[in-house]
Interface confidence: medium
């Protein structure tokens, strides 16, 4: 049976185990793996790999026995190992691969494990003695029996029959994402000094996650995905977002070399050596990694992370996974393969894509050439120097290339003629008995942001023209108005004359024609992604961020944009979070993106907001956000009560207590207050972060978010013995803004 790093099987155990004869045969490449747990409230038997050694822990009553294999013998070598553990007549014996490894006396008491047997992982079992146990098994259990009974039947859908090929796949075997919920998790991607992620991607997915690494601070992450057929990278750090697009299409079923590079100063994504990067000004700072590096898909937590984020990451997009494959994966320069994965879902070893799906189109010789953006610019110098054959006319002495190339300069969104000076011959054509019409150009790779337009019948489709057409101004480059300041065309130049000349001219030489784009300042304008109406609850505040309004300026970075709030500054409801009560009449795009601004409603009709945004040269037309303040309505969603044993504690969760408000897209603070004294216990709240080990302490009130984060509980403290169940009536009131709902 194959376990993929997050799966387990459960086997019920009706009675206490007096004798134990456990036989397991497993194989894994992971140094950590939970193999088997027999679980009771206190009694338990645990078999796990830890640092490649097998550890056995048996707890019977007050007694604890530990056995382990020697440090020299690592069992995480992908080879099947047979483990036999027997506990008979007060004696425990452990042997691995037929050799006796350890034995010890044990108490004669039976093993009380009413919670059952857990094979390969512990599931959702949350027992104190499970702290610090190994990760779930990623590997194979070829056999598992207890007292002659198989523990591998019945298999669940997540635990597969047989031993999956992926567990023995070497680094050079591709990661195949077969979908629809494929995912591979690897050890965290650290980017302290710098981080690199490299792989060759083959897919036809136009929308798919590629890589996700969460950060230590809540809300931080690095995310790389395919968005509308192109690569996109997002880094959320602190409160700022860095967003980067690459313009090379990747969803074409062809292999593409992808590289993501991040350091404290910049983020770069490169496809087929074609890079896009942020400016050096944007300081990203170190993202402390938390959890695993997810490739090809997202788990529930990562999906939630991205859906909470203000990018338009739709649930469909975050739930989808990559259909395709990644080859030659390397993380920070270290090769990674399926064997190193901590967890996989719906993965295949190797790149088994439907052949017909990825068949190349066979273009006819004179049919249109692809004008996709560059996939891989040849690494050699272009054109390749030509070595003329002996016996050619003297005009070809010292000949290496036909043309001298000069950059074509075009205004952003403008047009420019391709002229003689851009493609000037290096030799006298007349002396070489060549005519301009015999020098044939074909566009083998189009520019990313523009089109070479040919005013010649039939030539536009073929993307072919002659030097004579250039002289006659028949070829012009039309720029599409995008912001990149450089581009290039790849031209193949051949000569069709039947005169003596170097054979390389008949075959054709490849030239890169650089295109220099002179930028034009576009005025910014304001957009309201969710419409120009905002609803706020009376006497509350609502964050103003890019989800409410944002600036669109194709040629200015966020750093260069400033918003102004028009109208009188007195009583202006826009404020900075850290400067309450002080109107923010002007703020930067960075502040908006960082979530530093709030709309504060202090009563009366809400004030509409009219903004304009400026890039320092030009300002946008004013845009108005209509604001409507509505009275908070509080409705009890759940109030179920708790049942618990005297002296114990029980969390109060949203399933027990929650209210709903009429807030629209607003995360309002909901405060519960205890309005009466408690007789038999106390209400407690956990300290910040809700981390394990944070202190619980008594409280008289709490917020709904505390309940959602599992940070509120009721502790029974009554020491008296009662002959009946005592009932604690918890009287609460709820406050939202200035609205209070009593007698909850």
């Amino acid at each position: 049976a194959s376990f993929f790093g997050e799966n387990h099987l459960e086997v019920p155990v009706a009675t206490a185990l007096t004798d134990i004869d456990l036989q397991l045969q497993f194989s894994t490449s992971q140094p950590e793996a939970l193999l088997l747990l027999a679980a009771g409230p206190a009694d338990h038997l645990l078999l796990q790999l830890y640092s490649g050694r097998l550890q056995v822990r048996l707890v019977l009553g007050q007694e604890e026995l530990r056995l382990q294999t020697p440090a020299e013998t690592l069992l995480s070598d992908s080879i099947p190992h047979t483990v036999v553990l027997t506990v008979v007549e007060g004696w425990a014996t452990l042997s691995v691969d037929g050799f006796l490894n350890a034995s010890s006396a044990v108490p004669g008491a039976p093993l009380e494990v009413p919670y059952g047997l857990f094979v390969g992982g512990t599931g959702t079992l949350g027992l104190p003695y499970l702290r610090g146990t190994s990760r779930p098994l990623r590997g194979c259990l070829h056999a598992a029996t207890l007292n002659g009974r198989s523990l591998l039947r019945p298999l669940t859908p997540d635990v597969h029959e047989g031993c999956a090929e992926e567990f023995s796949a070497s680094d050079d075997v591709a990661l195949g994402f077969s979908g629809p919920h494929s995912l591979a998790a690897f050890p965290a991607w650290g980017t302290q000094d710098e981080g690199t992620l490299e792989f060759t991607l083959t897919t036809q997915s136009r929308q798919a996650p590629l890589a996700f690494q969460a950060g230590g601070r809540r809300g931080d992450f690095i995310y790389v995905d395919i968005f509308e057929g192109h690569l996109r990278a997002v880094v959320e750090k602190g409160q700022g977002t860095v967003l980067l697009h690459n313009s090379v299409p990747v969803a074409d079923g062809q292999p593409h070399e992808v590289s993501v590079h991040i350091n404290a100063h910049r983020l770069e994504i490169s496809v087929d050596q074609y890079p896009t990067h942020t400016s050096n000004r944007g300081v990203l700072s170190y993202l402390e990694p938390r959890g695993s590096l997810l490739l090809g898909g997202l788990d529930a937590e990562a999906s939630r992370h991205l859906q909470e984020h203000r990018l338009g990451l739709t649930p469909e997009a975050t739930n989808a996974s990559l259909l395709g494959c990644m080859e030659d994966l390397s993380v920070n320069g270290q090769r990674r393969g399926l064997r190193e994965a901590l967890l996989t879902r719906n993965m295949a070893a190797g790149c088994r894509l439907e052949e017909e799906e990825y068949e190349d189109d066979a273009y006819g010789h004179y049919e249109a050439f692809s004008t996709l953006a560059p996939e891989a610019w040849p690494a050699m110098e272009l054109p390749e120097p030509c070595v003329p054959e002996p016996g050619l006319p003297p005009v070809f002495a010292n000949f290496t290339q036909l043309l001298t190339i000069s950059p074509l300069v075009v205004a952003e969104g403008g047009t420019a003629w391709l002229e003689w000076r851009h493609v000037q011959p290096t030799l006298d054509l007349m002396e070489a008995e060549l005519r301009k019409s015999q020098v044939l150009f074909s566009v083998t790779r189009g520019a990313r942001h523009g089109e070479l337009e040919l005013d010649i019948p039939g030539a536009q489709a073929r993307k072919m023209f002659t030097l004579l057409d250039v002289v006659n101004r028949k070829a012009r480059f039309i720029h599409d108005g995008s912001e990149d300041t450089s581009d290039q065309l790849v031209l193949e130049v051949s000569v069709t004359a039947r005169v003596p000349m170097p054979s390389c001219l008949r075959r054709g030489q490849t030239y890169l024609l650089p295109i220099q784009v002179n930028p034009v300042n576009d005025p910014p304008h304001i957009i309201f992604p969710h419409g120009s109406l905002m609803v706020i609850l009376e006497h509350t505040q609502k964050p103003l961020g890019p989800e409410v309004f944002q600036a669109y300026d194709p040629d200015s970075a966020c750093e260069g944009l400033t918003f102004q709030v028009l109208g009188t500054s007195s009583g202006l409801p826009v404020e900075r979070r850290d400067q309450p009560g002080e109107p923010a009449t002007e703020f930067s795009c960075r502040e908006l993106e960082a979530g530093s601004l709030v709309y504060v409603h202090r009563g009366g009709p809400a004030q509409d907001l009219t903004f304009r945004v400026s890039d320092g040269l030009q300002a946008s037309p004013p845009a108005t956000l209509k604001v409507v303040a509505i009275r908070p309505a509080i409705q009890i969603h759940r109030s179920t009560g708790l049942r618990l044993a005297q002296g114990s504690a029980m969390p109060i969760l949203p399933a027990n207590l929650s209210v709903e408000t009429n807030a629209v897209g607003q995360d309002v603070s909901v405060l519960f207050r205890v309005t009466g004294a408690l007789q038999f216990g106390e209400l407690q709240k956990q300290g910040a972060g809700g981390v394990e080990g944070a202190e619980w302490w008594a409280t008289q009130a709490f917020h709904q978010r505390d309940v959602e984060q599992g940070r509120v509980r009721y502790l029974s403290t009554d020491p008296q013995h009662h002959a009946y169940d005592t009932v604690e009536n918890l009287a609460l009131e709820v406050q939202v803004g200035q609205e209070i709902l009593s007698n909850l």
Epitope: A677, G681, W697, Q700, A701, T717
Partner: antibody, heavy 122, light 107 residues
Framework: QVKLQQSGGGLVQPGGSMKLSCVVS????????MNWVRQSPEKGLEWIAE??????????YYAESVKGRFTISRDDSKSSAYLQMINLRAEDTGIYYC?????????????WGQGTTVTVSS | DIELTQSPKFMSTSVGDRVSVTCKAS??????VAWYQQKPGQSPEPLLF???YRYTGVPDRFTGSGSGTDFTLTISNVQSEDLAEYFC?????????FGGGTKLEIK
């Protein structure tokens, strides 16, 4: 009208002892957690001790600086809280306030006594 | 222990002005912060709890904001009776700790 009336305090020599009292009226004393907070020019406001309810087994918490020297106690029948201080030091000098946590969120002090001055000096 | 650093230590203002006091925690305290006002010769009195909720009877010119490590108390339209010292306090973990105080003087 909630009132926390303090008594005790005065001048005491280093190493000496002193007991502060706090009588509460205006609310059901047995439902409130009681605290002592002190204030000095050197250290500002400083929480020193807390006592919980009978149902909380009269749980007590102390600041590290007074642990083992100060004892907080309560007598619900007398609606009173006490702070017994032994082995007093010069740095214990300050105004001592008896305070309570009420029916609001978290551990902050919604009722304060008038304060009583403790001076530790030879 | 969680340290609370208040700034400024002293501030002078006029009636009708708006002033802000900041309180910085040495570690995350969520919104578990209270603010107190102590008038000369009196005991402290609660102003705000849970970082931004006004205590019963506190005028709405007192507002609070912040979460995590940075908190602000703002008094808009300062009145002469606001002459006092202001303290923040965290109740996120024991020991409960206070800021060093900010003395507000009315010109």
């Amino acid at each position: 009208q909630v009132k926390l009336q303090q008594s005790g305090g005065g001048l005491v020599q280093p190493g000496g002892s002193m007991k502060l009292s706090c009588v509460v009226s205006g609310f059901t004393f047995s439902n409130y957690w009681m605290n002592w907070v002190r204030q000095s020019p050197e250290k500002g406001l400083e929480w020193i001790a807390e006592i919980r309810l009978k149902s909380n087994n009269f749980g007590r918490y102390y600041a590290e600086s007074v642990k083992g020297r100060f004892t907080i106690s309560r007598d619900d029948s007398k609606s009173s809280a006490y702070l017994q201080m032994i082995n007093l030091r010069a740095e214990d000098t300050g105004i001592y306030y008896c305070t309570s946590y009420g029916n609001y969120v978290g551990h902050y002090f919604d009722h304060w006594g008038q304060g009583t001055t403790v001076t530790v000096s030879s | 222990d969680i340290e609370l650093t208040q700034s400024p230590k002293f501030m002078s203002t006029s009636v009708g002005d708006r002033v802000s006091v900041t309180c910085k925690a040495s570690q995350n305290v969520d919104t578990n912060v209270a603010w107190y006002q102590q008038k000369p010769g009196q005991s402290p009195e609660p102003l705000l709890f849970s970082a931004s909720y006004r205590y019963t009877g506190v005028p709405d010119r007192f507002t609070g904001s912040g979460s995590g490590t940075d908190f602000t108390l703002t008094i808009s339209n300062v009145q002469s009776e606001d002459l006092a010292e202001y303290f923040c306090q965290q109740y996120n973990s024991y020991p409960l700790t206070f800021g060093g105080g900010t003395k507000l003087e009315i010109k």
